[in-house]
């Protein structure tokens, strides 16, 4: 069985979260993808999404979030720059496939942002590095709103639980790793 894991990233304010979600490229290459935050007991909230159809390695920036979909590699790259303490939370990538439910991707990201910048391992980039040259053609994509009760997500259980998804058996496991990424000075 494939394990739906949750990775914990501990970063400082001003740093950048730089993660990826993989998908089956044959099925979902041009599908619209989204980055969502999951708050306890609430519906996942879409923060940014790619265009529809998704364009290959074409950056889409929505505020401090940059999405890049590498069709030919089956990877969605998500960057959240200039992190703030209030960005802390549980995030996930999904693929929109109307009229079906959004398809959740691996892995969920538990982001913990703390105050103050330090030189200890913790992120990909510091605030002085957060200048991303995004092509002027970049647009904000319109993200569909899904209200299906099946996408309401509770906080991850303390014990292992089964979660059903469209094409595979998935086990939700406890967080087992804290990822600290070297700071860029």
């Amino acid at each position: 069985a494939t394990k739906l894991t949750e990775e914990k990233y501990e970063l400082k304010e001003g740093q950048t979260l730089d993660v990826k979600c993989d998908y089956t490229l044959e099925k979902f290459a041009s599908s619209q993808k989204a980055w969502q935050i999951i708050r306890d007991g609430e519906m996942p909230k879409t923060l940014a999404c790619t265009e529809r159809p998704s364009k290959n390695s074409h950056p889409v920036q929505v505020g401090r979030i940059i999405l890049e979909d590498y069709h030919d590699h089956g990877l969605l790259r998500v960057r959240m720059v200039n992190l703030q303490v209030e960005d802390s939370g549980l995030y996930q990538c999904v693929i929109y496939q109307p009229p079906k439910e959004p398809h959740m991707l691996f892995d969920r990201i538990r982001l913990v942002v703390t105050k103050g910048f330090s030189g200890t391992p913790g992120s990909n980039e510091n605030s002085t590095q957060n200048v991303y040259k995004i092509p002027p053609t970049t647009t904000k994509a319109l993200c569909p709103l899904y209200t299906s009760p099946r996408t309401v997500t509770q906080a991850p259980p303390k014990s292992t639980a089964d979660v059903s998804t469209p094409d595979s058996e998935i086990n939700l496991t406890n967080v087992t790793d804290i990822i600290r990424v070297p700071v860029f000075n």
Epitope: T24, L25, L75, V181, F184, N185
Partner: antibody, heavy 122, light 107 residues
Amino acid sequence: QVQLVQSGAEVKKPGASVKVSCKASGYTFTRYDINWVRQAPGQGLEWMGWMNPNSGNSGSVQKFRGRVTMTRDTSIHIAYMELSSLRSEDTAVYYCARGGYTSSWRWYFDLWGRGTLVTVSS
Amino acid sequence: DIQMTQSPSSLSASVGDRVTITCQASQDIRKHLNWYQQKPGKAPKLLIYDAANLETGVPSRFSGSGSGTDFTFTISSLQPEDFATYYCQHYANLPITFGQGTRLEIK
């Protein structure tokens, strides 16, 4: 200990396929990407693609698309790379290499197999 | 694709020398750059990641610096075991590409 152990050298005819295996031990196989890098004799390093051993998803560079298949068997912690329609220019040492966490945009390769020499000759 | 150009392609040096290798990216890669050492018949070994971070267990005589398009790899005092080929590798986007390598030989 933490290591990647690859299958032995192969000699293949043009047009044939080769399947190289890479057995991981000493770490949680499903938490890190497996990448494949090849090196032709006397040449530099060429990244072929990646695989997430947890989801089974993979991707390869355009040059190899349609010829390379990356799979895994999580029960025995083995990753496979199959290259088909072999030609003489595919003669190279093929390495598997551990990447960063499956969720991280950290494409550094901190653990390598010893390499598998694939010779394509008629 | 991003092209990585290393220079020089080869150099001769003596034990104790300070050696510098440069790597230039065809576009801005911020600090998404790694350095590897490869000895004949062996697999590459990660030395430096994210432009300047020393991999665990790698001697402190190895160092890296730079950001954007220009990067430098330095060995402060060459040891006999350092004679090898060195490669830079970017991961600013996909596909990942390596520099062509710098062969470090004994003078």
